[in-house]
Amino acid sequence: LSTCKTIDMELVKRKRIEAIRGQILSKLRLASPPSQGEVPPGPLPEAVLALYNSTRDRVAGESAEPEPEPEADYYAKEVTRVLMVETHNEIYDKFKQSTHSIYMFFNTSELREAVPEPVLLSRAELRLLRLKLKVEQHVELYQKYSNNSWRYLSNRLLAPSDSPEWLSFDVTGVVRQWLSRGGEIEGFRLSAHCSCDSRDNTLQVDINGFTTGRRGDLATIHGMNRPFLLLMATPLERAQHLQSSRHRR
Amino acid sequence: LSTCKTIDMELVKRKRIEAIRGQILSKLRLASPPSQGEVPPGPLPEAVLALYNSTRDRVAGESAEPEPEPEADYYAKEVTRVLMVETHNEIYDKFKQSTHSIYMFFNTSELREAVPEPVLLSRAELRLLRLKLKVEQHVELYQKYSNNSWRYLSNRLLAPSDSPEWLSFDVTGVVRQWLSRGGEIEGFRLSAHCSCDSRDNTLQVDINGFTTGRRGDLATIHGMNRPFLLLMATPLERAQHLQSSRHRR
Amino acid sequence: ALDTNYCFSSTEKNCCVRQLYIDFRKDLGWKWIHEPKGYHANFCLGPCPYIWSLDTQYSKVLALYNQHNPGASAAPCCVPQALEPLPIVYYVGRKPKVEQLSNMIVRSCKCS
Amino acid sequence: ALDTNYCFSSTEKNCCVRQLYIDFRKDLGWKWIHEPKGYHANFCLGPCPYIWSLDTQYSKVLALYNQHNPGASAAPCCVPQALEPLPIVYYVGRKPKVEQLSNMIVRSCKCS
């Protein structure tokens, strides 16, 4: 490549590589690479690989990363996941079986363990593995709000599909609320979209984690693939750095 | 400002001003400023000013402009608007009065006059002037699909408000479809969000352009402020330039 | 668009995204990132000629303007447009961590 | 953020958005744009010091990295981040036209 003077492509590559060295360490707020002396031998644990793969895979309904906020979002986010409370928990008994909805509850103590303060959360996604679907289905996501009321969050038009597919809903604001409140268990409801005229409001889509002898007959969980919250948050110690440097520039 | 050498701020400003001269002409695909010899004397026509103000004002539900596609979206878009067919038109008689919906129909010949080819359309917004609203209302927008079926498009949670406020819905895909099809009149429905359990599904929000002795008792139009489609499209002659230069670079 | 599809398959001399794969072990001498082993970082390179002045023969410039200086900058610069994040796995002591690093992969460039 | 709120009220020497109002008649000698009479175009200016090399004392650099070279470019550059469109009214012959020009107003800048 030449402009007024010849560009040394190799030099540019070396500078870019060195800049990436600084970028990665700075995003992790590490002054030097972490020591590997304590690392257990053998392959990475299954759960860690599953979490890594969940993060790596783009899923239906997740948009490409928007332009980040300059400061806090520059730094790396720790990724954790919290699985839905198993369906034999008594919380599910309070919600009447229905053909148009399924319910998903989460233990807020697990959420707080992963993200100690609401301000640290930068993204929360509800991920559901939808099994094959014969017809197009319009679904809505609700958040449990007070005693028996539900607040609408978002909707999705699901195309028919022969293969299972992960769905993702951005629930950052909701999880941030939950972390601020004192509740022990919080939940979502996935419902068929009900139009004012329509009579057939059955939830046709199968979500992994609920057996479907009948919709609402909530029972066994299919392994790790039941619904979960994928959380991205600034680790506490990194956040303390940030606060102390907030007034600089 | 100084780096290794002092920056001449005035020179930078002059270069930026000259660059803007080129940018504006190039976005309009004008080789030189248009002659003003034929411009009628006196102020701008009212309708033109109204259209300019509609374009200038950001409204509820309209996102900031996304990063544009590099080629076609670099160039200026001509802005036009098409008002909803007046409610005394017989098309409205076919749709039963209901407490949960209002209907808005548009003449596709007017749309085609504004945008001769579907591919030229870059954005279409349905704009509605909502009057004051006492309670929060969750509304849904539908597109007339076939004989008497409606396709869900999007939804909006409207906060209570003492003053009128413009709402905007992105309906680009729908209007592009309409331009491709042969229909004469096409339409939207704005409905209350109906949940599967809920009984009270009344559309509480008043939209300017419909008298509200009873919802659905569609009658007089309040001037130019009835619902309209705001269209942004590449003018035909500019598009021809683009096609001829498509294989360059 | 000056993206990987266009730039990797052409010999474009002006602003474009250029291929660069970083192997953490080979290029940075790092063993501490356990996943991935490396990634396609890429980078932006190439001139954005400043192509407007009062005496320019304008008709020749018109078609190029939106590529070389669409933002009408006083000194246009070839910079990333679309970026993607990179998740990594590393250990802190005995504890494995999964972290997501924003804006690590350059997918396309622009003159800005 | 290096936006108008921060930059217009500070004496920031590094990359920042700078104030620039363009009056179509005075600055460009144009009478043909009927609305608006001018607009706040603004521009980006200021160095993005390159602040990483193998021998850098890293702890001093850490806090600055995300401002001066967040994208790890080989030569970081101060460029627009958030841009806004500008609608204009002009005549073609006797016919008034309203057109929207994308990305005309610089609201914030970044090192990229």
């Epitope: - | 004008l30 400023p33 002659s35 | - | 012959g93």
Partner: antibody, heavy 118, light 107 residues
Framework: EVQLVQSGAEVKKPGASVKVSCKAS????????MHWVRQAPGQGLEWMGR????????AYAQKFQGRATLTVDTSTSTAYMELSRLRSDDTAVYYC???????????WGQGTLVTVSS | DIQMTQSPSSLSASVGDRVTITCRAS??????LNWYQQKPGKAVKLLIY???RLHSGVPSRFSGSGSGTDYTLTISSLQPEDFATYFC?????????FGQGTKLEIK
């Protein structure tokens, strides 16, 4: 190639009318206004008027108001200029010219000589 | 109407010469000044529009400059095919008006 082809030379008696045609090709006829300009022997160029083929809108120079009539046939991409009540000083070459909105004439016909003589 | 005064009305020059023709408007025409070339029996050709913009296909030896009321056409090095009559025209205000022409002849 963009072209304007005009009708052939005419000889007319004073008081008569003449109708000159101008056939456009190589571009969208309705996208550009068509202007008429004349040039008397040994003189400069004089603008007569213009027509917008899309809307039919017309403007005349004051001197030709009431005597010149501009028309178009969009089906054949042809513009016409008719001048009535001819006088000897109307002897000139008549040109049609395509107008660009920048205020200039970018394509011209080859000209039609109209001679008015008794 | 805006009056356009062109000078000189004729001039003789040789191949390779640099030639300048001027055009003065009776009021400010804000750069809407165009130059045309006319040869006997041929269609009129646009050379320069908006003071200094070269029309496509026109050799770069032709250039234009000026502002306000005073404008100039320059041919940097005359070629045999440049001997013709040149007209200026204002595109600022209706009615469009032309200069009376400058006839460029071989010396």
């Amino acid at each position: 190639e963009v072209q304007l082809v005009q009708s052939g030379a005419e000889v007319k008696k004073p008081g008569a009318s003449v109708k000159v045609s101008c056939k456009a090709s190589g571009y969208t006829f309705t996208s550009y206004w068509m202007h008429w300009v004349r040039q008397a022997p040994g003189q400069g160029l004089e603008w007569m008027g213009r027509i917008d083929p899309q809307s039919g809108g017309i403007a005349y120079a004051q001197k030709f108001q009431g005597r010149a009539t501009l028309t178009v046939d969009t089906s054949t991409s042809t513009a016409y200029m008719e001048l009535s009540r001819l006088r000897s000083d109307d002897t000139a070459v008549y040109y049609c010219a395509r107008w660009d909105y920048g205020g200039y004439f970018d394509v011209w016909g080859q000209g039609t000589l109209v001679t008015v003589s008794s | 109407d805006i009056q356009m005064t062109q000078s000189p009305s004729s001039l003789s020059a040789s191949v390779g010469d640099r030639v300048t023709i001027t055009c003065r408007a009776s009021q400010d025409i804000t750069n809407y000044l165009n130059w045309y070339q006319q040869k006997p029996g041929k269609a009129v050709k646009l050379l320069i529009y908006y003071t200094s913009r070269l029309h496509s296909g026109v050799p770069s030896r032709f250039s234009g400059s000026g502002s306000g009321t005073d404008y100039t056409l320059t041919i940097s090095s005359l070629q045999p095919e440049d001997f013709a009559t040149y007209f200026c025209q204002q595109g600022d205000t209706l009615p469009w008006t032309f200069g009376q022409g400058t006839k460029l002849e071989i010396k």
